[in-house]
Interface confidence: low
């Protein structure tokens, strides 16, 4: 359990940099995370909206706080989900 947990952690932390990448090859991963963010009402992997770097400006409603009952914060003038997605992803992987 702890070993697999460590591998998942490392993989997610490693993949955080893909969110701020601008190449075509990273787009699929970015789009998967966008869908996950909307489903689980979270933002980014480790550092929240900052994980997206300049891509935050290219996706007009990235992390948009639709359900304001959930914790939200202001980032670059937009209301975004405060919670990062890493714990949700780990839970999701553990259950599936």
């Amino acid at each position: 359990k702890s070993k697999s947990d460590r591998i998942v952690n490392e993989t997610l932390y490693e993949n955080t940099k893909l969110l701020s990448a601008t190449g075509e090859s990273e787009k699929q991963f970015q789009e998967a995370i966008i869908v996950f963010q909307e489903e689980f009402k979270c933002c980014g992997l480790v550092n929240g909206a900052a994980d997206w770097g300049n891509n935050f400006q290219h996706y007009p409603e990235l992390c948009a706080c639709l359900d304001k009952q959930r914790p939200c914060q202001s980032y670059n003038g937009k209301q975004v989900y405060k919670e990062t997605c890493i714990s949700f992803i780990k839970d999701f992987l553990a259950k599936n």
Partner: antibody, heavy 121, light 106 residues
């Protein structure tokens, strides 16, 4: 200036279908979330559905879930509401409205004049 | 679903007088509340958003206040064009409207 013009309303029998359209102009349609809001004769306002700027996310009121479908064509600056399995209680003026944001997660800032849908046998 | 309750259902006021309309949410909606005005045969029009911010071009006689669950729309000196139905709407968790307050001439 922002203009929202609804069409497609009319009289329809219970159980039948109808599709409403909303032609938008005076703003960058593809940047805004859009809602449908309805008002039964002599009654208050009821939120029906919302669609994000890019059509990716859609949300519905429980009263219409599974029967109504909201969609948009950004190339035509048009919003749609496909209404199936219509019931008498769906009789209302249907307003096409614009959200202040792209995600359709904020307040409604512009309204069309509405189109009347009457469900009656 | 967050329920919005407006009171009174009807408010009878003389022109020039002050009108105070109330709106209560079943749970906190922070400041995510808007007010709309609707005249007979017309579409609603945005008056206030963020509980207290006036929409562009709205006269200063209209003001909104409150946060959490209790909100107020005040019209300081009613003009003939202000007699209408007023709705509050929360956008904190999806969207729900109050049932409306009709402001009529006394």
């Amino acid at each position: 200036q922002v203009q929202l013009v609804e069409s497609g309303g009319g009289v329809v029998q219970p159980g039948r279908s109808l599709r409403l359209s909303c032609a938008a102009s005076g703003f960058t349609f593809s940047s805004y979330g859009m809602h449908w809001v309805r008002q039964a004769p002599g009654k208050g306002l009821e939120w029906v559905a919302v669609i994000w700027y890019d059509g990716r996310n859609k949300y519905y009121a429980d009263s219409v879930k599974g029967r109504f479908t909201i969609s948009r064509d950004n190339s035509k600056n048009t919003l749609y509401l496909q209404m199936n399995s219509l019931r008498a209680e769906d009789t209302a003026v249907y307003y096409c409205t614009r959200d202040h944001s792209g995600s359709g997660s904020y307040y409604i800032d512009y309204w069309g004049q509405g189109t009347l849908v009457t469900v009656s046998s | 679903e967050i329920a919005m309750t407006q009171s009174p259902a009807t408010l009878s006021v003389s022109p020039g007088e002050r009108a105070t309309l109330s709106c209560r949410a079943s749970q906190s909606v922070s400041s995510n509340l808007a007010w709309y005005q609707q005249k007979p045969g017309q579409a609603p029009r945005l008056l206030i958003y963020g509980a207290s911010t006036r929409a562009t071009g709205l006269p200063a006689r209209f003001s909104g206040s409150g946060s959490g669950t209790e909100f107020t729309l005040t019209i300081s000196s009613l003009q003939s064009e202000d007699f209408a139905v007023y709705y509050c709407q929360q956008y904190n968790n999806f969207w729900t409207f109050g049932q409306g307050t009709k402001v009529e001439i006394k």
